[in-house]
Interface confidence: low
């Protein structure tokens, strides 16, 4: 068992471990979230640069200075092009967010074009439609009752969104494979003792070839692929989606990482590696959105000034475009961007940023030397939440993303999406269709607390990500037509 | 395990109404979506409509919507299927099943209740 002297040693402090849990007992009992966990410990040492800490017994660095997180995500990425997350490259394993730097490389000069502004406005009319869809059906409901667990039912459609413009499958069509968001729920609230494990014995995943994926999902991926590839006869079928441009890739059988396309930094690509992004996809694109609406109309449940001049806004915009939500009217409503920023950073979803060195590395403006392969880790909710960076930070302010503002503030104080090279290739696509669905929710109804809402809601343990627990209840008003 | 138990069914005359049950026992905390299911003599079971427990999401075929109605009582572990202008097509055993939280197929099913229609 390794001793917990590793920051000591470097004269680096951190929060006394205990034995076994290092740091991380808390989340490692599922009594807390990662992300809270992180939030807590960042806020221990307020005075400095980086923390020594423990993720059970390994020692990583927790990084807070603004400067340095700037290092590591931009400036010197090419160290940190890894996220250090080592498991069975198998299966699930090497998809474009958990794949070491040379893989991720290889997907994503391929990847990045998916998400270019004309791919999105074809895009855009596919979301429309689950919007509209889902806007009915919350009408149909509130006939019967006002009152809606808002996170599960903004997952119905962000999965529907992302289903469509992914993979071109209309969930209407497939009946009872609407609800895959089952299968793919497992992943995110079903707690993996494997990370745990990683972290105590780095590599012994990869090792042993053990997956931190259920074989259920794995499945499911494989079914979806499978069928996807045999309808489009295995080539492109000309949507231009998500699904064309992995059929191309294995038509092509494999892509380089590097400029010169050498065969030794080539990737194979095969039916795994095409679930893998598939998997990737489907996490990405439905989960994160749905939260972040989630909280984005809870906060506007709570304050109703701000959820009021949203309303005036869109009424605005919608009544300037014959009530039509286009892509351009849903970037041109300011306010309603704004408030999208402010849930983002009072819920950053993604928590915490963890990258890896790969060769050891001096931190800047510090004495501290890091070792090949240690892990770092960054706390946007504990940035997001400083008072240094934000006043008064658990209030809802929309204005805190003013361009004068924003402005002011450090380029590395607000990391929802993470920072640099590698940070959410999918950021636009997220944005777009949550804020069409609240442009939609908002014209329909106006959002009050409920007499079951929680006004202390706290984090979920159980899920990856950062979630509401026990959901987010609050009743759906439909407005009166105002002639 | 989850129990399914259909009632409902019957011999009815075309245009006629009938409302089918089913009422869920056992781990129904697991159940996240109800669904009947229809299989004529001859052809492939079919799904007709689906609702979620939590949010009450509802799915209808192409081919019953507007004539079918699916509700659900929480309270109650049981799902209704109302059937409206009932067609001779519409002849076939009604299957009730449920689905757990995550899978994508139904796996747990209900013994099935016949459904008539005469011209």
């Known amino acids: 068992m390794r001793t917990f002297n590793y920051w000591k040693k470097r004269n680096v402090r951190g929060p006394e471990p205990v034995v076994f849990f290092g740091n991380l007992k808390d989340s490692a009992l599922r009594k807390k979230n990662m992300g809270v966990v992180m939030e807590e410990l960042y806020n221990m040492f307020p005075e400095e640069k980086v923390i020594g800490i423990y993720r059970m017994t390994s020692p990583c660095l927790l990084v807070r200075d603004l400067d340095v997180i700037k290092h590591i995500m931009i400036k010197d990425f090419e160290v940190f092009s890894d996220r250090g997350v080592e498991f069975s490259k198998e299966g699930l394993g090497s998809n474009l967010f958990h794949a070491d730097g040379e893989t991720w490389r290889a997907l994503g000069n391929r990847f990045t074009p998916i998400f270019t502004s004309g791919k999105l406005k074809n895009m855009f009319y596919l979301m429309h439609e689950g919007a509209d869809n889902f806007i009915d059906h919350v009408s149909a409901e509130c006939e019967k009752n006002q009152e809606f667990e808002v996170h599960s039912l903004l997952q119905t459609y962000t999965m529907s969104t992302i289903a469509a413009c992914a993979f071109g499958i209309s969930y209407d069509s497939i009946g009872d494979k609407v609800k895959a968001l089952d299968i793919v729920d497992k992943i995110i609230s079903e707690p993996s003792y494997a990370i745990e494990l990683d972290m105590m014995y780095p590599g012994l995943l990869s090792k042993l070839n053990l997956s931190i994926f259920p074989t259920v999902v794995k499945n499911f991926f494989k079914s979806l692929v499978d069928n996807i590839v045999a309808q489009r006869n295995g080539k492109p079928s000309g949507r231009n989606d998500f699904m064309d441009l992995i059929l191309e890739l294995r038509q092509l059988g494999e892509v380089t990482s590097n400029k010169y396309g050498s065969s030794a930094s080539s990737l194979e690509i095969t039916d795994e590696v095409i679930c893998a992004q598939a998997f990737v996809f489907y996490i990405a694109g439905y989960e994160t959105s749905a939260t972040t609406m989630a909280y984005m109309i809870y906060q506007l449940a709570l304050n109703p000034d701000i959820q009021n001049k949203l309303i005036a806004e869109v009424d605005e915009v919608l009544k300037a475009n014959d009530g039509k939500v286009t892509y351009d009217t849903v970037k041109e409503m300011k306010y309603l961007n704004k408030a999208f920023d402010e849930t983002l950073r009072m819920y950053s979803i993604v928590e915490p940023l963890q990258r890896k060195a790969t060769r050891d590395y001096k931190i800047p403006g510090t004495d501290v030397v890091i070792e090949k392969d240690t892990i770092v880790l960054i706390s946007p909710r504990g940035i997001h939440y400083d008072p240094k960076y934000y006043d008064n930070p658990k209030q809802f302010n929309p204005d805190r993303f003013d361009a004068e503002e924003v402005g002011k503030r450090h380029p590395c104080a607000y990391l929802p999406f993470g920072l640099g090279q590698r940070n959410c290739i999918g950021m636009r696509f997220g944005r777009l269709q949550s804020l069409l669905c609240i442009t939609k929710i908002l014209s329909k109804f106006r959002i009050e607390p409920s007499k079951n809402t929680d006004r202390n809601l706290q984090v979920e343990p159980h899920r990856g990500l950062i979630g509401p627990k026990g959901g987010i209840r609050v009743n759906a008003i439909p407005r009166k037509l105002v002639s | 395990q989850v129990q399914l138990q259909e009632s409902g069914g019957g011999s009815v005359q075309a245009g006629g109404s009938l409302r089918l049950s089913c009422a869920a026992s056992?781990?129904?905390?697991?159940?996240?979506?109800m669904g009947w299911f229809r299989q004529a003599p001859g052809k492939e079971r079919e799904l007709v409509a689906d609702i979620a427990w939590s949010d009450g999401r509802i799915y209808y075929s192409d081919s019953v919507k507007g004539r079918f109605t699916i509700s659900r009582d929480n309270a109650k572990n049981t799902v209704y299927l109302e059937i409206d202008s009932l067609k001779p097509g519409d002849t076939a055993v009604y299957y009730c099943a449920s689905r757990a939280r995550g899978t994508v197929s139904y796996n747990y099913w209900g013994q099935g209740t016949q459904v008539t229609v005469s011209s």
């Open positions: 056992g781990r129904t905390s697991r159940s996240y979506a």
